[in-house]
Interface confidence: medium
Amino acid sequence: LQDPCSNCPAGTFCDNNRNQICSPCPPNSFSSAGGQRTCDICRQCKGVFRTRKECSSTSNAECDCTPGFHCLGAGCSMCEQDCKQGQELTKKGCKDCCFGTFNDQKRGICRPWTNCSLDGKSVLVNGTKERDVVCGP
């Protein structure tokens, strides 16, 4: 016997209190699949998060980060502070890369310069805090 709730489309829930009719999701909630017995609360993009896509009755809101921050985690579950190129984020904030390391992005950690001699090459252009060395013949 077919479950009558399976006829309820996305954007509705199957209302058991009303003979399993399909009721529209309340404001600020959604159901992305059919046959649901409740709707889900919309994600709210607050504080350092900002709304990239509004919630609809059939899909959740999507967030990104305000300027000066970038997304981390699945679905932008966290926002992390940007640093300048040549820096990395530590517990004490943005710190310059140590000598011999670089970071060419606003996120991530400082990485060691390439060791040209390992490939039998010499340094053509010296590295900086923002750029890796360029190896030459």
């Epitope: 829930f13 209302d15 209190n17 009721s23 999701c25 309340p26 404001p27 600020n28 909630s29 017995r37 409740t38 709707c39 889900d40 609360i41």
Partner: nanobody, 122 residues
Framework: EVQLLESGGGLVQPGGSLRLSCAAS????????VGWVRQAPGKGLEWVSA????????YYAESVKGRFTISRDNAKNTLYLQMSSLRAEDTAVYYC???????????????RGQGTQVTVSS
């Protein structure tokens, strides 16, 4: 026991106004997310308007924006829907509803009243 009693419906000409009331008992309106749903003849339920986040924000369906205004009187534990510039397509039974948040994040709603009929016709 939770009860919601709607009133204020009637027959009105296109362009006219009505104010619907919903007297609540068994719970405190000001502490809940509440609103209005309607059911037009031969159609499904539709959310019209709601007061959410304990009054922090309001919701209006696109079809009623700028024409309907939701409000509540906490002292009287009553919810209102001021309807103006009414159109034939606003003809429906209007129900007062309370949003219900379930453990685990699910959301449904509850409407217990008989509704109030609004008919817009010349």
């Amino acid at each position: 026991e939770v009860q919601l009693l709607e009133s204020g419906g009637g027959l009105v000409q296109p362009g006219g106004s009505l104010r619907l009331s919903c007297a609540a008992s068994g719970f405190t309106l000001s502490a809940e997310d509440v609103g209005w749903v309607r059911q037009a003849p031969g159609k499904g339920l539709e959310w019209v308007s709601a007061i959410l986040d304990s009054g922090g924000s309001t919701y209006y369906a696109e079809s009623v924006k700028g024409r309907f205004t939701i409000s509540r009187d906490n002292a009287k534990n009553t919810l209102y829907l001021q309807m103006s510039s009414l159109r034939a397509e606003d003809t429906a039974v209007y129900y007062c509803a309370r949003v219900v948040y379930h453990a685990g994040g699910g959301v449904t709603y509850d409407y217990r009243g008989q509704g109030t009929q609004v008919t817009v016709s010349s």
